[in-house]
């Protein structure tokens, strides 16, 4: 999906209002310095591309982020403010349904969410630089 035509201001507002709080709740008890951020993004479409991939694509080390509250809200936000996004997400929805129901938060998932926080912060910063 090409995120170029999203309403970035609206996505920022949704992130600051709800998604950020859910990400921080998921990370509760973990210091932001516990993990080294190894990926970043350079502009708004790039940031959303990487956020989408890291949130919804299961990885060998962390297969279960897609069913978390912040992921559901991220999906809703992208569907709301990115034209045509929801039509591209049928396969992703199936992947979410197949995701393990276990609520165990592994260290690797914490690390992945730490990376997500970094990508979202970069998204906000790139937004500020464009204004």
């Amino acid at each position: 999906y090409d995120f170029t035509n999203c309403d970035f201001q609206k996505i920022e507002a949704d992130y600051l209002r709800t998604i950020s709080k859910d990400l921080i709740t998921y990370m509760s008890g973990t210091k932001s310095t516990d993990f080294n951020n190894t990926v970043s993004c350079s502009n708004r479409p790039h940031c959303l591309t990487e956020i989408q991939s890291l949130t919804f694509n299961p990885t060998p080390r962390c297969a279960s982020l897609a069913k978390e509250m912040f992921a559901r809200k991220t999906k809703a936000t992208l569907a709301l403010w990115c034209p045509g996004y929801s039509e591209t997400q049928i396969n992703a929805t199936q992947a979410m349904k197949k995701a393990r129901k276990s609520k165990v938060t592994t260290n690797k998932c914490l690390e992945q969410v730490s990376q997500l926080l970094g990508l979202w912060r970069r998204f906000i910063r790139t937004l500020l630089k464009k204004q």
Epitope: V39, S42, H46, S53
Partner: antibody, heavy 117, light 108 residues
């Protein structure tokens, strides 16, 4: 200390597919970063080809996108480049590199690929 | 596409002299710029990222400055091992990361 090592045929015929592999040691490619390919034609500048992130997302240079595939094998801790329908213009030193998806922090030593019949 | 233009193409200096290399972007890229050094037969090495941040392990004689469209790499006092080709790279315009054509710093 991460180390990267490119390998693959040094000679490819026109219209065939160029295939290269980058073996990574000292860091797991599924633990972090992105894993990129960059090339440099003889005596010329650098051109970014694309990357695959540690979580599997890929991004390609739009000018090469229709011909490029980057994949990975986490069990062998390596990633690969396939470039189809090559011509003499694809003759270059090909580098693999570790990236944070912005700039390129660690590089392999490079491998020269010549496209010729 | 953002085009990166480096000048001069060649810089002839003596060890101990100050080197000033320029990189210009065809449109604004904020501070999304990196500098690399490449010696003959070797891979490039990252020197500077985000226009002015020194990569770990790089000597302090290297410094970067600039924002928007105009950027500078400065080597305060050239050492013999600094004679090489230097490239700038912009990463503002994903997925079109682009490099400058290079500046060769040679011994006068």
């Amino acid at each position: 200390q991460v180390q990267l090592q490119e390998s693959g045929p040094g000679l490819v015929k026109p219209s065939e597919t160029l295939s290269l592999t980058c073996a990574v040691s000292g860091y797991s490619i599924s633990s972090g970063y992105g894993w990129s390919w960059i090339r440099q034609p003889p005596g010329k500048g650098l051109e970014w080809i694309g990357y695959i992130s540690y979580y599997g997302s890929t991004s390609y240079n739009p000018s090469l996108k229709s011909r490029v595939t980057i994949s990975r094998d986490t069990s062998k801790n390596q990633f690969s480049l396939k470039l189809s329908s090559v011509t003499a213009a694809d003759t270059a030193v090909y580098y693999c590199a570790r990236t944070n998806l912005l700039y390129f922090e660690s590089w392999g030593q490079g491998t020269l690929v010549t496209v010729s019949s | 596409e953002i085009v990166m233009t480096q000048s001069p193409a060649t810089l002839s200096l003596s060890p101990g002299e100050r080197a000033t290399l320029s990189c210009r972007a065809s449109q604004g890229i904020s501070s999304y710029l990196a500098w690399y050094q490449q010696k003959p037969g070797q891979a490039p090495r990252l020197l500077i990222y985000d226009a002015s941040n020194l990569q770990s392990g790089i000597p302090a004689r290297f410094s970067g400055s600039g924002s928007g469209t105009d950027f500078t790499l400065t080597i305060s006092s050239l050492e013999p091992e600094d004679f090489a080709v230097y490239y700038c790279q912009q990463y503002s315009n994903w997925p079109q990361y682009s490099f400058g054509q290079g500046t060769k710093v040679e011994i006068k």
